[in-house]
C-alpha cells in the first residue's frame, strides 16, 4: 500500500478539538485525492468523515462534518471538532489517489486521540 | 530487577489529577517498602514524589507532596494532583524493598500522562 | 492510447529460465508501480510480482508461489518491466500479463512448460 | 495473508436480471478492493477500483459496494456482452490476491 504517515498520539484540546497532518507518499503525480478519516474502537471501524479534493484546491467536507483540513502537497491537515470523552480512540487516516488512473490506496497505523471532558464552570448567579 | 508493572497511558482529569495503580511481583515478605514517582521527560529524569511504608499501613508523603497513596498487598494506588499540559510526560514507579534483607529493586516501564490544561470559565460579571 | 506489450513467452522446458519483456507506452511509466500477473485454468488470476517506482526505492514484492524463482526489474528509460523466472514448472503455465497497478493491462504472453 | 472468498463460481441469468456476486476478505481491508472482467481470449479489464468507483468506460449499469469484510458487484439489466470471468482483488497489500472467480452465462 502506498504509505501513509500520521502522529501516534493527540490530545483534543479542552473545547474538544483535535488536529493532526496525514502525510502521504504519492508514487506518481494525482490531481484527485480522496481523504478519510476511520474511528477504531473495539474492532469496529467507523467513517468519521470524507473529503475528495483536486491537489492546490482546498478540502471540501460535507456542512454537517464534524471535519474540516486543508492541504498542501502531499501533507492534509486535518481538524476534528466536537469530540467528547467518549470518542476516545485511534483515528485512521485513510488516502486515495483516485485520478489520473492507477488507483493508489493507503491507509496509517492511526493517531490515538484522547478525549478530557472539561469541568463545567460553576453557575454565575 | 523485581518486576513492576503499572498502566501505559493514563489521561489526567480536568481537574489536571492523575491516578494509576503500581504493582510489584515480591520475591518475600516485606515488612518495609518505598515507592518513588519519577518523571523522564526530554531525557531528563525527576523526581516527583516518594514515601515508605510498612505493610499493612498507609502511604505517607511528605505534606507539601503533590502525591497521594493507599497501598494493598503488593499494590500501590498512586494519585499525582495538580499537573498542567506542561507536566505531561511519562511517570516511572520505582519499587524499593527496604526491609527485612536483601534489598530488591523493581522499575516499571512508565505511565505516560497526558494533561491537558481546561479552558478559563467566563468571567461572572 | 495506452500500450502494455509482453514479448518473451514461449515453450520451455521444466527447469529452464525465461525472461519476459513488457514495453509501457501512452502514460508516465515511472510514475506507476508494475505488477505481473498471470491467469490459468486451474488458478484463474494470479497476482505474481510488484516493482515499485522510484519514490519507493523501487521496492519489489512476490507472491509465495514465485518467491525465490521469479524476479521482477524495470528499466524507466525503456518504458520496460521485466520478469525473469528460473527453475519453471509445469504449474508456472498460463498467460503472463503485466499491468500498471491493475489499472492497464496487455494483451498477455502465453508460457508453455513441458519436457 | 488476506484470503479473498468469492461467490458463486457460476452463474446463469437472463438478459435484464439483475445479478450480484459477493467477496468476502478474512481481514478488513479498508474498501482496498477491485473488480475485473475478463472475457473469453481477452485481457481483464479493471471495472469497479476503491469497492465502489466505476473505472473510467465502463458501463454504469455496473456498481460496487461495501466496506470492511463484505464487498459486492452488482450488474443491473444484463446484456449478451456481460458474458465474462469477473474476480476481486484485493488492492490493500502484498500479495495482491484475487478471488477465484465467477463465470456469468446469459
Known amino acids: 500500500a502506498m504509505h501513509v504517515a500520521q502522529p501516534a498520539v493527540v490530545l483534543a484540546s479542552s473545547r474538544g478539538i483535535a488536529s493532526f497532518v496525514c502525510e502521504y507518499a504519492s508514487p506518481g503525480k494525482a490531481t484527485e485525492v480522496r481523504v478519510t478519516v476511520l474511528r477504531q474502537a473495539d474492532s469496529q471501524v467507523t467513517e468519521v468523515c470524507a473529503a475528495t479534493y483536486m491537489m492546490g484546491n482546498e478540502l471540501t467536507f460535507l456542512d454537517d462534518s464534524i471535519c474540516t483540513g486543508t492541504s498542501s502537497g502531499n501533507q492534509v491537515n486535518l481538524t476534528i471538532q466536537g469530540l467528547r470523552a467518549m470518542d476516545t480512540g485511534l483515528y485512521i487516516c485513510k488516502v486515495e489517489l483516485m485520478y489520473p488512473p492507477p488507483y493508489y490506496l493507503g491507509i496509517g497505523n492511526g493517531t490515538q486521540i484522547y478525549v478530557i471532558d472539561p469541568e463545567p464552570c460553576p453557575d454565575s448567579d | 530487577a523485581m518486576h513492576v508493572a503499572q498502566p501505559a497511558v493514563v489521561l489526567a482529569s480536568s481537574r489536571g489529577i492523575a491516578s494509576f495503580v503500581c504493582e510489584y511481583a515480591s520475591p518475600g515478605k516485606a515488612t518495609e517498602v518505598r515507592v518513588t514517582v519519577l518523571r523522564q521527560a526530554d531525557s531528563q529524569v525527576t523526581e516527583v514524589c516518594a514515601a515508605t511504608y510498612m505493610m499493612g499501613n498507609e502511604l505517607t508523603f511528605l505534606d507539601d507532596s503533590i502525591c497521594t497513596g493507599t497501598s494493598s498487598g503488593n499494590q500501590v494506588n498512586l494519585t499525582i494532583q495538580g499537573l498542567r499540559a506542561m507536566d505531561t510526560g511519562l511517570y516511572i514507579c520505582k519499587v524499593e524493598l527496604m526491609y527485612p534483607p536483601p534489598y530488591y529493586l523493581g522499575i516499571g516501564n512508565g505511565t505516560q500522562i497526558y494533561v491537558i490544561d481546561p479552558e478559563p470559565c467566563p468571567d461572572s460579571d | 492510447e495506452v500500450k502494455l506489450d509482453e514479448t518473451g513467452g514461449g515453450l520451455v522446458q521444466p527447469g529452464r529460465p525465461m525472461k519476459l519483456s513488457c514495453v509501457a507506452s501512452?502514460?508516465?511509466?515511472?510514475?506507476?508501480?508494475m505488477n505481473w500477473v498471470r491467469q490459468s485454468p486451474e488458478k484463474g488470476l494470479e497476482w505474481l510480482a510488484q516493482?515499485?517506482?522510484?519514490?519507493?526505492?523501487?521496492?519489489?514484492y512476490y507472491s509465495d508461489s514465485v518467491k525465490g524463482r521469479f524476479t521482477i526489474s524495470r528499466d524507466d528509460s525503456k518504458s520496460s518491466v521485466y520478469l525473469q523466472m528460473n527453475n519453471l514448472r509445469g504449474e508456472d503455465m498460463g498467460i503472463y500479463y503485466c499491468?500498471?497497478?491493475?489499472?492497464?493491462w496487455g494483451q498477455g504472453t502465453l508460457v508453455t512448460v513441458s519436457a | 495473508d488476506i484470503q479473498m472468498t468469492q461467490s458463486p463460481a457460476s452463474l446463469s441469468a437472463s438478459v435484464g436480471e439483475t445479478v450480484t456476486i459477493t467477496c468476502g476478505t478474512s481481514?478488513?481491508?479498508?474498501?482496498?478492493l477491485n473488480w475485473y472482467q475478463r472475457k473469453q481470449g481477452k485481457s481483464p479489464q479493471l471495472l469497479i477500483f476503491?469497492?465502489?468507483n466505476l473505472a473510467d468506460g465502463m458501463s454504469s449499469r455496473f456498481s460496487g459496494s461495501g466496506s470492511g469484510r463484505q464487498y459486492s458487484l452488482k450488474i443491473s439489466s444484463l446484456h449478451p456482452d456481460d458474458v465474462a470471468t469477473y474476480y476481486c482483488q484485493n488492492v490493500l497489500r502484498s500479495p495482491f490476491t484475487f478471488g477465484s472467480g465467477t463465470k456469468l452465462e446469459i
Open positions: 516493482i515499485r517506482n522510484k519514490p519507493y526505492n523501487y521496492e519489489t
Open positions: 481481514e478488513n481491508i479498508y474498501g482496498g
Open positions: 499491468t500498471a497497478q491493475f489499472a492497464y
Open positions: 501512452g502514460f508516465t511509466f515511472s510514475d506507476n508501480w
Open positions: 476503491g469497492a465502489t
